[in-house]
Interface confidence: low
Amino acid sequence: LPAQVAFTPYAPEPGSTCRLREYYDQTAQMCCSKCSPGQHAKVFCTKTSDTVCDSCEDSTYTQLWNWVPECLSCGSRCSSDQVETQACTREQNRICTCRPGWYCALSKQEGCRLCAPLRKCRPGFGVARPGTETSDVVCKPCAPGTFSNTTSSTDICRPHQICNVVAIPGNASMDAVCTSTSPTRSMAPGAVHLPQPVSTRSQHTQPTPEPSTAPSTSFLLPMGPSPPAEGSTGD
């Protein structure tokens, strides 16, 4: 005969673990159902009744199978200098990132508190270090033989073109001008653009409980804790 399928709640066999999407309730000493993403535990299981789940309220979420008593609060709405790259739904937190051309100048525990525009290097200066999600552009003066004639957060110093006959010598902010005879070689006819950083910062570094007596967010781990093995002492 095939083995009987146990329905939650059930007492696990000594030394065995609860099945996927179940957790071990130390009070009931039973394997009980977890709630699906977008839900939370409204009533915890007992020896005779399974977990009762309920949908997350507006502006709250659970991303994983869980048994938290309250859904997690979605992060604050994105500020005007940020873009919402992921909306708050019942199953996922809002993600706010600094908009393109900006970086996070002041981080707050729940995400970026203040975005600032990336520095633009003025003519005569080029990008020495590109901006990232959390750091500004670093500019440097163009070295002899190179120039930048733009005000840009991405352009680097480019070599002067090499002329057969120079009409106007180049400087840090201007390319060399050749006489009507064409230059022997143009090192970099177009502006060189550094790749823009792509921000992936989330509002919350970890799921954060709504003000409540919610247990540790470690309860949101994909696999629930197992009951103590035979012969061991439980918590």
């Epitope: 970890q206 409980p209 247990p215």
Partner: antibody, heavy 117, light 111 residues
Framework: EVQLVQSGPELKKPGASVKVSCKGS????????MGWVRQAPGQGLEWMGW????????FYADDFKGRFVFSLDTSVSTAYLQISSLKAEDTAVYYC??????????WGQGTLVTVSS | DIQVTQSPSSLSASVGDRVTITCITS??????????LNWYQQKPGKVPKFLIH???NLRSGVPSRFSGSGSGTDFTLTISSLQPEDVATYYC?????????FGQGTKVEIK
């Protein structure tokens, strides 16, 4: 149950130092920042600043830069406020408070620091 | 820094009265349509208690006679029917940016 438990009252002489502790329980301590608020006798609430419990980076309001230091021991889920070169005007109740995105949602019971010669 | 001003500094009202406290910030505390303005209640000799977040959202467990409204720079806390247990000092606080700043408080007493 979320709880913030602070150390007991302190009586100090001017020029001395004091260190107030705040132990968090009932939640993952490093999930949320910890703020500090001062209330002088008969006065209102003053926000002193906060400390990032993941990085240990403090932020101080202008009036609390210099003699005030926020620190952490995450292994025991505890935040600390140290005040050096105490003055009579530092006499106050100091509260630690959990810095949730919605607001200062849980508060310690407060620690009275009295500075008197 | 954003300055926060409350009025009145104190008031006395009868049980059952409607009580209104105002809070004005020196610049807007709104971001993308959300007002980062919180209200706290501190009863005599007690720890402050978090009442309202984002201008109008009651914290769970707070009696429904409390309500908050406003946006931008002008905010109001209303107690629709004052009860003896509402005797306290009420503080507004802006959470738009660091440093957070509190109003000076409004002391509510029973006549």
């Amino acid at each position: 149950e979320v709880q913030l438990v602070q150390s007991g009252p302190e009586l100090k002489k001017p020029g001395a130092s004091v260190k107030v502790s705040c132990k968090g329980s009932g939640y993952t301590f490093t999930d949320l920042g910890m703020g500090w608020v001062r209330q002088a006798p008969g006065q209102g609430l003053e926000w002193m600043g906060w400390i990032n419990t993941q990085t240990g980076e403090p932020f101080y309001a202008d009036d609390f830069k210099g003699r005030f230091v926020f620190s952490l021991d995450t292994s025991v889920s505890t935040a600390y406020l140290q005040i050096s070169s105490l003055k009579a005007e530092d006499t106050a109740v100091y509260y630690c408070t959990r810095d949730h995105p919605l607001g200062l949602d849980y508060w310690g019971q407060g620690t009275l620091v009295t500075v008197s010669s | 820094d954003i300055q926060v001003t409350q009025s009145p500094s104190s008031l006395s009202a009868s049980v059952g009265d409607r009580v209104t406290i105002t809070c004005i910030t020196s610049q807007s505390v709104d971001v993308a349509g959300v007002s980062y303005l919180n209200w706290y209640q501190q009863k005599p000799g007690k720890v402050p208690k978090f009442l309202i977040h984002k201008a109008s959202n009651l914290r769970s467990g707070v009696p429904s006679r409390f309500s908050g409204s406003g946006s931008g720079t002008d905010f109001t806390l209303t107690i629709s029917s004052l009860q003896p247990e509402d005797v306290a000092t009420y503080y507004c606080q802006q959470a738009r940016e660091d440093p957070y700043t509190f109003g000076q408080g409004t002391k509510v007493e029973i006549k």
